[in-house]
Interface confidence: low
């Protein structure tokens, strides 16, 4: 297995609508035609898969229809957006990149992006 460097921002603050975006960049050592990107969430020493997408170089990422993630790719950069986040989803989001084809297979795991999510204050009731 060959290691590959993956870079991602250290900290991102989600918007008031629960949307967080960050760039995952990988230093491709080979000429991959198929890439798989997986977002993992680490919280309290538990690691869970948030979403994953496979794409052909030059094409768009394809996440499952019910995924909370969307993304676009440009060269060796993947722009990831995670939606529907709430305060309880605050945690370290790790970008994992795999060069699936052609071989040899490469695996790269970023150090993670700490995403902070703050639930918006509820609007006070108005009497009109």
């Amino acid at each position: 297995c060959k290691a590959m460097h993956v870079a991602q921002p250290a900290v991102v603050l989600a918007s008031s609508r629960g949307i967080a975006s960050f760039v995952c960049e990988y230093a491709s050592p080979g000429k991959a035609t198929e890439v798989r990107v997986t977002v993992l969430r680490q919280a309290d020493s538990q690691v869970t898969e948030v979403c994953a997408a496979t794409y052909m170089m030059g094409n768009e990422l394809t996440f499952l229809d019910d995924s909370i993630c969307t993304g676009t790719s440009s060269g060796n950069q993947v722009n990831l957006t995670i939606q529907g986040l709430r305060a309880m989803d605050t945690g370290l989001y790790i970008c994992k990149v795999e060069l699936m084809y052609p071989p040899p297979y490469y695996l790269g795991i970023g150090n993670g992006t700490q995403i902070y999510v703050i639930d918006p204050e509820p609007c006070p009731d108005s009497d009109f």
């Epitope: 795999e98 040899p104 297979y105």
Partner: nanobody, 126 residues
Amino acid sequence: QMQLVESGGGLVQPGGSLRLSCAASGFTFSSYYMSWVRQAPGKGLEWVSSIYSDGSNTYYADSVKGRFTISRDNAKNTVYLQMNSLKSEDTALYYCATPRGAHGPTYCSGGYCYYGGQGTQVTVSS
């Protein structure tokens, strides 16, 4: 500890068929991208085929395309290689492998590094 045990090899005549099996243990098999690689006598390691963790995508070396089929059964922690229309040049030691292993022997050759088992010998001869 991660373990991969291959079986199903043997002596077969040209044009014949074999089905290799690889039983995995010691790791979450269903999360792993699996491959078959082979090493012919006196030659380096050659990648043969790979399959996604969920079995949704498969890949083959040009030399085996249309003759070999890789598959997996995650419930049984097993990956298979169905080999049809075998040729003498398919004679080799076949290894089931995952590139993500943290334990076990490592096979490296020509830019490929895989973690795998002890292999199963396939000999194609008349």
